[in-house]
Interface confidence: low
């Protein structure tokens, strides 16, 4: 049994880091493998992660980490029984994938303005709470070409757009994702999408 693709890990910078790897053949990850992880400095003990299958030869492990800080560095040991298959290290702050925003809501009751709001996925005491920026994706269910991205570079988890910038009388969907420049993170997954029917009063024609 050998590791074909070494583990790569990303952290949500809160409580979970996810490591994925591939073996050289079909593997029952949960029964055959264990991923041990330990903070390099002294405020921890070794922990064991039981991997799950992720495709025939792929494995994924969700490492529980409380209170991640920028200097944390973990050693990773991948074991198959008594055999050490791979040894490496992982610094969560250098491989951050933020959590996806939640509770995306489209408020259509503001005259001719669409207000989109969502929740910051981090608690206020987490470093990323005040460092997230967002991308909002709005698209038409009827017209695949009607697809737009709005970058929200301020901290408030909301976006206002004029309803008239979208077509009237058709349904739209929106979703939002987050990233943090401070840690040069990857983008989060998209939030679940939300749907609304866009309608607004056409302004009177000018004569």
């Amino acid at each position: 049994m050998k590791v074909l693709q070494e583990p790569t890990c990303v952290s949500d910078y809160m409580s979970i880091s996810t490591c994925e790897w591939k073996m050289n053949g079909p593997t029952n990850c949960s029964t055959e493998l264990r991923l041990l992880y330990q903070l390099v400095f002294l405020l921890s003990e070794a922990h064991t992660c039981i991997p799950e299958n992720n495709g025939g030869a792929g494995c994924v492990c969700h490492l529980l980490m409380d209170d991640v800080v920028s200097a944390d560095n973990y050693t990773l040991d991948l074991w198959a029984g008594q055999q050490l298959l791979w040894k490496g290290s992982f610094k969560p702050s250098e491989h951050v994938k933020p959590r996806a925003p939640g509770n995306l809501t489209v408020h259509t009751n503001v005259s001719d303005t669409l207000l989109l709001t969502w929740s910051n996925p981090y608690p206020p005491d987490n470093y990323l709470y005040n460092h997230l920026t967002y991308a909002v994706n709005i698209w038409s269910e009827n017209d695949p070409a009607d697809f737009r991205i709005y970058n929200v570079t301020y901290l408030e988890p909301s976006l206002r757009i004029a309803a008239s910038t979208l077509k009237s009388g058709i349904s739209y969907r929106a979703r939002v994702r987050a990233w943090a420049q401070c840690y040069n993170t990857t983008w989060s997954e998209w939030s679940p999408s939300t749907k609304w029917h866009n309608s607004y009063r056409e302004p009177f024609e000018q004569h």
Epitope: F41, L42, L43, D66, D67, V69, S70, A71, D125
Partner: antibody
Framework: EVQLVESGGGLVQPGGSLRLSCAAS????????MSWVRQAPGKGLEYVSA????????YYADSVKGRFTISRDNSKNTLYLQMSSLRAEDTAVYYC?????????????WGQGTSVTVSS | DIQMTQSPSSLSASVGDRVTITCQAS??????LAWYQQKPGKAPKLLIY???NLETGVPSRFSGSGSGTDFTFTISSLQPEDIATYYC?????????FGGGTKLEIK
């Protein structure tokens, strides 16, 4: 100006208990790893205990494990060391220190120390 | 535990002398090493961290070098106020450990 002010030391009989406090000011206490280091009379330095920024992770030297408890109250900017089942070898000056980075590393600020004497 | 062997345990030097103290770790500690100065009746003061980085506000006559197991602390030109005991401290392994100290006196 950064200040760490320890209190709570004193004379205690073997088997007794003491609670040391360290009042911090002049820096963001709630995001700092903190620790206690002690120095027996005429001796060198010994790392005793450490705690991370939110109190979720703690560390104890083998010599005090099970007897000492480190804690913090970020709302009061105060670090604590609850010491029980004290022994003569716990006699020392106890220093409250701040870790230089957000991990257990070099200690850039130290209090003036509080003296603990365990004797009958 | 990682043992930190500091030498010499004491030394006497004249004002203006170059003073060198060494610290040897029983196993690799990378550059996770600090140096402290402690004057009688006072708390230790951080001088050097990460083996060679000078702490803010510390005079440039103090310096550190080394990595792995062998480290050196140098005072380029000894001043009267440098009379103190100096400690090395590794924070790579658990538990963090200190050297036994070097007591520096003026001739």
């Amino acid at each position: 100006e950064v200040q760490l002010v320890e209190s709570g030391g004193g004379l205690v009989q073997p088997g007794g208990s003491l609670r040391l406090s360290c009042a911090a000011s002049g820096f963001t206490f709630s995001s700092s790893y903190m620790s206690w280091v002690r120095q027996a009379p005429g001796k060198g330095l010994e790392y005793v205990s450490a705690i991370n920024s939110n109190g979720g992770k703690t560390y104890y030297a083998d010599s005090v494990k099970g007897r000492f408890t480190i804690s913090r109250d970020n709302s009061k900017n105060t670090l604590y060391l609850q010491m029980s089942s004290l022994r003569a070898e716990d006699t020392a000056v106890y220093y409250c220190t701040r870790q230089r980075g957000n991990y257990v590393g070099a200690m850039d600020y130290w209090g003036q120390g509080t003296s603990v004497t365990v004797s009958s | 535990d990682i043992q930190m062997t500091q030498s010499p345990s004491s030394l006497s030097a004249s004002v203006g002398d170059r003073v060198t103290i060494t610290c040897q770790a029983s196993q690799d500690v990378s550059t996770a090493l600090a140096w402290y100065q402690q004057k009688p009746g006072k708390a230790p003061k951080l001088l050097i961290y990460s083996a060679s980085n000078l702490e803010t506000g510390v005079p440039s006559r103090f310096s550190g070098s080394g990595s792995g197991t062998d480290f050196t602390f140098t005072i380029s030109s000894l001043q009267p106020e440098d009379i103190a005991t100096y400690y090395c401290h590794q924070y790579y392994g658990s538990p963090p450990t200190f050297g036994g100290g070097t007591k520096l006196e003026i001739k």
